[in-house]
C-alpha cells in the first residue's frame, strides 16, 4: 500500500507536471505567438483511456512531437529551452509512471491539436491530484 | 504517394565540396522535416541532420557540424545537403528522408526515402 | 549518445523458421524506436515504428516488442525476401542513432 509520504512526493510530481503543461499552453496561447496557426496544424494522439498513471506511457509518447512543436514558438514565451523544458517534463513522467512496466498505450481514433492535447493531460493532473488530496 | 529523388553520383577530391539534392514530390515539401542519412560500404547507417524547410531551422550531428549545410528551397520542393572538406571516409550513400507530424503516427518516423547518392571522395 | 547494440550480427536460418533480433538501447527511450529492413543496392525500409507498431504494407509475420531498454525484432516464419540486413533507430533524442545492424542469411 502506499504511504502518505510516497503518496506527498507523488503528488508533488503531479502538480509539476501540471504546472508545466500549463506554463506551455500559456505561451502557446500568447496572443504575440506568430507561430500559431501552424502549430496547430501538428497532429497529436490522445489515449483511449487516461485515469491511471501507468496511462502516462501515452503522453510519454507525445513528448517528442511536442519537443517539435516548442521549437516552433518563440523561446521567449518559455523559460526553458523546449530541449530542456521536454527533458524536465520526461523526467518526472518516467517517475510517476514507472520504467518497470511496459504499458501498451492506446490511441483514440481522433486526433487533436496541440491546445486540446495539452487540455487533456492537464485535466488528467488534475483528476489524479484530487483522488490523492 | 511521396518520392523523393535524389541527384546522382559525385566523384570529388579530398578537400572539396558535394552538394547532394532531393525532391519531394507527391506533397509539399513544407510538410515534412528532411533528414539526411550516410551509409559508409558495408557499414551501418549515421544520421547527419535535418531541417525544417518551413521556417529553415536545422539540427545537426555533432560529427557534422561545421562542415554540414542542409537548406530547402520551397519553390521546387527541393532539399539539399552540401558537405565540404571531404576526406576518403566521406565515401558513403547519402540518404534523404522524412518525418511529419501533420499525418499518421507511422510517418512521423523515417517513412520515406530517396533512392540515395554514391559520393565517392578519392585523389 | 544513446548507443543501441544489435544481437547477432549475424543470424543463419532456413525458410519457415523463426527468426528473433535483438537491439538493446544504453538508456531508457520509452517505445521511441523503429525497426528497418535493407537489401544489397536499396535504401532502408520501415518495418516497425514506435517499438511494437507494424508499418503499412508490411506483412503480419513481423513483430516488435519491448522491455525495459530491451527491443526485439521477430519474424515468425521467414520468407525468401525476408534474408537481409535489419537496423534499430532510436528517435527519443538527437542525435539519433542505428544499430550497428543484423545480418540475417540464409543457412
Known amino acids: 500500500a502506499p504511504t502518505s509520504s510516497s503518496t506527498k512526493k507523488t503528488q508533488l510530481q503531479l502538480e509539476h507536471l501540471l504546472l508545466d503543461l500549463q506554463m506551455i499552453l500559456n505561451g502557446i496561447n500568447n496572443y504575440k505567438n506568430p507561430k500559431l496557426t501552424r502549430m496547430l496544424t501538428f497532429k497529436f494522439y490522445m489515449p483511449k483511456k487516461a485515469t491511471e498513471l501507468k496511462h502516462l506511457q501515452c503522453l510519454e509518447e507525445e513528448l517528442g512531437p511536442l519537443e517539435e512543436v516548442l521549437n516552433l514558438a518563440q523561446s521567449k514565451n518559455f523559460h526553458l529551452r523546449p530541449r530542456d523544458l521536454i527533458s524536465n517534463i520526461r523526467v518526472i513522467v518516467l517517475e510517476l509512471k514507472g520504467s518497470e512496466t511496459t504499458f501498451m498505450c492506446e490511441y483514440a481514433d481522433e486526433t487533436a491539436t496541440i491546445v486540446e492535447f495539452l487540455n487533456r493531460w492537464i485535466t488528467f493532473c488534475q483528476s489524479i491530484i484530487s483522488t490523492l488530496t | 504517394q511521396v518520392q523523393l529523388v535524389q541527384s546522382g553520383a559525385e566523384v570529388k577530391k579530398p578537400g572539396a565540396t558535394v552538394k547532394i539534392s532531393c525532391k519531394v514530390s507527391g506533397d509539399t515539401i513544407t510538410a515534412y522535416y528532411m533528414h539526411w542519412v550516410r551509409q559508409a560500404p558495408g557499414q551501418g547507417l549515421e544520421w547527419i541532420g535535418r531541417?525544417?524547410?518551413?521556417?529553415?531551422?536545422?539540427k545537426y550531428a555533432e560529427n557534422f557540424k561545421g562542415r554540414v549545410t542542409i537548406t530547402a528551397d520551397t519553390s521546387t520542393d527541393t532539399a539539399y545537403m552540401e558537405l565540404s572538406s571531404l576526406r576518403s571516409e566521406d565515401t558513403a550513400v547519402y540518404y534523404c528522408t522524412t518525418v511529419t507530424f501533420y499525418y499518421t503516427r507511422e510517418l512521423r518516423w523515417f517513412a520515406y526515402w530517396g533512392q540515395g547518392t554514391l559520393v565517392t571522395v578519392s585523389s | 549518445d544513446i548507443v543501441l547494440t544489435q544481437s547477432p550480427a549475424t543470424l543463419s536460418l532456413s525458410p519457415g523458421e523463426r527468426a528473433t533480433l535483438s537491439c538493446q538501447a544504453s538508456?531508457?527511450?520509452?517505445?521511441?524506436l523503429s525497426w528497418y529492413q535493407q537489401k544489397p543496392g536499396q535504401a532502408p525500409r520501415l518495418l516497425i515504428y514506435?517499438?511494437?507498431s507494424l508499418a503499412s504494407g508490411i506483412p503480419a509475420r513481423f513483430s516488435g516488442s519491448r522491455s525495459g531498454t530491451d527491443f526485439t525484432l521477430t519474424i515468425s516464419s521467414l520468407e525468401p525476401e525476408d534474408f537481409a540486413v535489419y537496423y534499430c533507430?532510436?528517435?527519443?533524442?538527437?542525435?539519433?542513432?542505428f544499430g550497428q545492424g543484423t545480418k540475417l542469411e540464409i543457412k
Open positions: 538508456q531508457y527511450i520509452s517505445n521511441y
Open positions: 533507430l532510436q528517435h527519443y533524442s538527437t542525435p539519433y542513432t
Open positions: 531541417i525544417d524547410p518551413e521556417d529553415d531551422s536545422t
Open positions: 514506435s517499438a511494437t
